[in-house]
């Protein structure tokens, strides 16, 4: 069912351009052009495209999620399951998702069973990694081609709205009949959009997009698009650093920068600022970095780790350009993400037997393995972690006790709140809480706390939301087949009778409630069915999710040309060093903690289960020291003023790939090869670009005057205005007459 032919590949570029003007689809339709430079083989492209040259879209950002089973839509190609309340499945209507939440999933905040084995960091890592590999964009509040409903205002199923209906007896005082729900955007030319291509049929059902690269590539740190990557990098440093917060520091350590002022302010404002209803969110490789403090903490940790590695690599290889340092540090950070996920995280989730069965040892790159994240994985299976989220944010002092000044916060108090970190003692108290406090154990009759089902808060929304109902509704929106179809897909027996269900779900009351609601086992939503299953031995998922997560992880590993264990990616010495590293070491290197557990995912008591950072092994970067052969005619490459070069090899010959620093453009040859006579061409030149002359994308806001400088530009403000944090907008300096 995994197609390599894109639905639009057969169309001419002229026709595509016409359609693009109507639909905005062009960027996603044109097959990516894969550069044939040795650099393309050395560092992964930011979009994930061209990882597999036979299937350049596999795993790339802004492509459709993979289908492991065909979707099930009510009209055969686009309408979600449950769209028409009278539509019967196996003789019964599907239960409203909110009813399922209320009767099966939701428990009060006080009902939490602590995981006796794993720390809250295990939960946080799962969410963080999910945000590395998948983000499904939603339709905007208006449908793409006019006439669309505003989903905040309607309780009718009217594209792009698929509201979550509330039962009459359980509506808030205001009497709202529904919770808003926006359908995920259709991949270009699928479902209803097939009409544009004359292909409105069940053979071209609605597909959903992944806005991120599927690959485990630390896109949480670096982004999944060139535009975002540009925003994230510090272009003035010679060390290939990432941008950090310009003003605020955490005991000398960096914070994430804020989004630029031009971006919509979608987070909670700084406390004590009168009249402010919203403030900026953190800027990171994934837009959800401010969602919850645990997620912000990991984004911050890896920003620091990149900058630490970049500085160390530059000190080791002074001849490296800023770009080379950036790419090498990015490569190491990406490898660490892969190692921590596949070596430390996934085996805990699947259990050793299922890990062996579905993932197994690495046997090298497989060009037939499609690494594209599957719809069922991102929409259902990997959302198992929502049932492990503790309703409290715990912040601990240096003795790993409840912090006297920083009491535990209910989760809803910390949603989209950068100031929880910035004004809450910084990163260390949060990291201590994640290390030394247990995750919530996923128990069949305690699946999700009210913090997530009653008080989930998004500033763009007028009311609170319900994560459990959203997950169920999202599965239906995406046309995911039911629980039994997926069990069959995984080679597990279908569950036909209540007794069958009781073998999979030990809690008789939960199994009975599920059947009371769904009436037929085939109708059970896959997220709920998988979530409620008994855990496999030494696992935190049941057999269905272990299968789906395992298959996905194997595909992400085996189908990734840049996987850290693939022989061309690192030297043997570098691989040996990388293996020594761990999340505990990353914490030691980038926080004020001096004692950590040897295994960051194992919940431990302080101090007895904590080790001194001195005894936590890590990689020795000596393995990254670059030396040049003394016997070739080329010698040390010539540097180019205002430009960089990166070394790579092609057919056993040294190659230099030049690039110009930000604000300069290349003139001459981009790539030089070492021959027996020396370099085959003269190095190129880097000429200054006059950014101020760019009328299409003016670098300064209209409030500022632009002045060209060598390699850049300056935005100037007239008194009494001053330059804002973004360096482009003039803001009130506080001296304007009131």
């Amino acid at each position: 069912t995994q197609q390599s032919q894109h639905p639009t590949d057969a169309l001419s570029e002229d026709l595509l351009s016409i359609i693009a003007n109507m639909s905005g689809c062009l960027p996603y339709m044109l097959p990516p052009k894969c550069p044939n430079t040795c650099l393309a083989n050395k560092y992964r492209p930011i979009t994930g495209a061209c990882n597999n040259r036979d299937h350049p879209r596999w795993g790339a950002s802004n492509t459709a999620l993979a289908r492991w089973l065909p979707p099930v839509y009510e009209d055969g190609f686009s309408q979600p399951r449950g769209w028409n309340p009278g539509f019967l499945y196996n003789g019964f209507p599907l239960p409203p998702v909110r009813e399922v939440t209320r009767h099966v999933i939701q428990v009060s905040n006080e009902v939490v069973t602590d995981d006796d084995r794993y720390s809250d960091l295990l939960m946080a890592w799962g969410q963080y990694i999910d945000h590395d590999i998948a983000f499904t964009p939603q339709s905007t509040s208006k449908a793409a081609f006019g006439g669309g409903a505003d989903c905040q205002m309607t309780c009718e199923n009217q594209n792009p709205c698929f509201p979550i209906q509330l039962p009459e007896e359980a509506r808030p005082a205001a009497g709202t009949a529904c919770l808003p729900f926006y359908r995920s955007s259709a991949a270009c030319g699928t479902g209803d959009q097939g009409a544009l291509f004359g292909n409105l049929s069940t053979a071209n059902p609605r597909q959903q997009m992944n806005g991120l690269t599927s690959f485990l590539d630390a896109s949480t740190v670096y982004g999944s698009s060139p535009a975002l990557e540009r925003q994230l990098r510090n272009w003035t440093s010679a060390e290939g650093l990432l941008r950090v917060h310009a003003r605020l520091r955490d005991s000398g350590r960096a914070y994430l920068p804020f989004v630029p002022p031009r971006a919509p302010a979608a987070c909670a404002p700084e406390p004590g600022i009168p009249g402010e209803t919203r403030g900026p969110c953190f800027l990171a490789g994934d837009g959800r970095a401010s969602e919850v403090p645990s997620l912000t903490a990991l984004h911050t940790l890896w920003l620091r780790e990149h900058n630490r590695l970049a500085a160390a690599l530059k000190a080791l290889n002074a001849h490296w350009s800023a770009d080379a340092v950036y790419q090498e540090a990015r490569k190491v950070v990406g490898a660490l993400h892969q190692i921590i996920t596949l070596r430390d995280y996934i085996p805990r989730i699947l259990g050793p037997e299922a890990f062996q069965q579905y993932v197994g040892p690495y046997e090298g790159y497989d060009s037939t393995a499609n690494p594209t994240v599957s719809n069922v994985f991102s929409t259902a299976a990997f959302r198992f972690g929502h049932a492990t989220i503790h309703p409290l944010v715990r912040r601990l002092d240096a003795s790993f006790q409840e912090h006297p000044d920083l009491p535990g916060l209910w989760l809803h108090q910390a949603f989209f709140s950068p100031w929880t970190l910035l004004r809450g003692g910084g990163l260390d108290p949060l990291i201590r809480g994640l290390l030394a406090r247990p995750a919530k154990l996923q128990v069949q009759d305690q699946l999700m706390n009210e913090e997530l089902t009653e008080r989930l808060f998004v500033l763009s929304n007028s009311s609170t939301l319900d994560l459990a109902s959203i997950n169920l509704q999202r599965g239906r929106d995406h046309g995911l087949p039911g629980y039994n179809e997926w069990r069959e897909f995984c080679g597990l027996p279908r569950l036909e009778t209540p007794a069958d269900l009781s073998t999979a779900i030990a809690s008789r009351s939960v199994a009975d409630k599920i059947l009371d609601l769904y009436k037929h086992p085939d109708n059970i939503d896959v997220w709920l069915g998988g979530l409620a299953e008994n855990f496999l031995p030494r696992a935190r998922t049941g057999p269905l999710f272990a299968c789906l997560i395992g298959k996905q992880m194997k595909a992400l590993r085996d189908g990734d040309w840049f996987w850290w264990e693939n022989s061309h990616v690192f030297t043997d010495a570098q691989r040996r060093e990388l293996e020594k590293h761990s999340l505990s070491r990353v914490i030691c290197d980038n926080t004020g903690l001096t004692r950590v557990p040897m295994d960051a995912f194992q919940v431990g008591k302080f101090p007895e289960d904590f080790e001194s950072c001195d005894s936590i092994t890590g990689m020795n970067l000596e393995a990254w020291r670059e030396t040049f052969p003394q016997d070739d005619k080329c010698g040390f490459p010539e540097s180019v003023e205002n430009g960089d070069f990166v070394h790579c090899e092609e057919s056993g010959r040294r190659v230099l790939v030049y690039s110009c620093r930000h604000g300069y453009e290349l003139q001459g040859r981009e790539q030089l090869t070492c021959t027996q006579e020396g370099w085959d061409f003269q190095p190129p030149l880097c000429k200054d670009v006059n950014e101020c002359a760019d009328g299409a994308h003016p670098p300064c806001h209209a409030s500022a005057r632009c002045r060209n400088t060598k390699g850049g530009f300056q935005c100037l403000c007239a008194d009494p205005y001053e330059l804002g944090d973004d360096g482009r907008t003039c803001v009130d300096s506080g001296r304007l007459p009131r």
Epitope: L88, Y89, N90, G91, F92, R494, E496, T497, P498, A499, D500, R508, D512, L515, K519, H520, P521
Partner: antibody
Framework: QVKLLESGAEVKKPGASVKVSCKAS????????MHWVRQAPGQGLEWIGW????????RFAQKFQGRVTMTSDTSINTVYMELSGLRFDDTAVYYC????????????WGQGTTVTVSS | ELVMTQSPSSLSASEGDTVTITCRAS??????SNWYQQQPGKAPKLLIS???TLQSGVPSRFSGSGSGTHFTLTINSLQPGDFATYYC????????TFCQGTKLEIK
């Protein structure tokens, strides 16, 4: 309305096979399990097994395993139950009955097919 | 296999009486029991599903209760057409066993 129409009475010799049909009308045939139940003269009801017509999946009582086959032809909304290796004690009325799920009561029954095994 | 035991196996009553038939399961079957009525020479008719859900068209004098291992069928104010054989059945686990039946006769 919902109806199940079974094939006519059969007389078979021991060791032979019998194939009984059950044609459904008045409902979405594929969405409902079809069960087969038999009743020997003067005895109680005995469940033989079920078929899920849309998938062709079946489940049988252990007693009939290996002797019974259930199939469906969705184009004509018909299910079949074949019992092989007939014995004298297989003499019974064979009913098809439908239910919206495997475990809710059988709410619609066929009129029954009398199968007599005699030499 | 799950065993269903019904009592009594036969019962005599008069028009207007109330009768109760009980059924025991050999293990917990939650509420997955059904009750059928069978007139001589006819196919069985479903009266009650899921222990207590009355089928449409079935008179309200019939009622079912119970869960776990113990279930009852109660018929209030017996009518002439109620004299028949009654079967309970479990649909919790396969095979879906019936009990031996209770023959309700006119006294």
């Amino acid at each position: 309305q919902v109806k199940l129409l079974e094939s006519g009475a059969e007389v078979k010799k021991p060791g032979a096979s019998v194939k009984v049909s059950c044609k459904a009308s008045g409902y979405t045939f594929t969405g409902h399990y079809m069960h087969w139940v038999r009743q020997a003269p003067g005895q109680g009801l005995e469940w033989i097994g079920w078929i899920s017509p849309n998938r062709g999946a079946t489940r049988f009582a252990q007693k009939f395993q290996g002797r019974v086959t259930m199939t469906s032809d969705t184009s004509i909304n018909t299910v079949y139950m074949e019992l092989s290796g007939l014995r004298f004690d297989d003499t019974a009325v064979y009913y098809c009955a439908t239910t919206r799920t495997a475990y809710y009561g059988m709410d619609v029954w066929g009129q029954g097919t009398t199968v007599t095994v005699s030499s | 296999e799950l065993v269903m035991t019904q009592s009594p196996s036969s019962l005599s009553a008069s028009e207007g009486d109330t009768v109760t038939i009980t059924c025991r399961a050999s293990e917990n079957i939650s509420r997955y029991s059904n009750w059928y009525q069978q007139q001589p020479g006819k196919a069985p008719k479903l009266l009650i599903s899921a222990a207590s859900t009355l089928q449409s068209g079935v008179p309200s004098r019939f009622s079912g209760s119970g869960s776990g291992t113990h279930f009852t069928l109660t018929i209030n104010s017996l009518q002439p057409g109620d004299f028949a054989t009654y079967y309970c059945q479990q649909t919790y686990s396969s095979p879906f066993t019936f009990c031996q039946g209770t023959k309700l006769e006119i006294k």
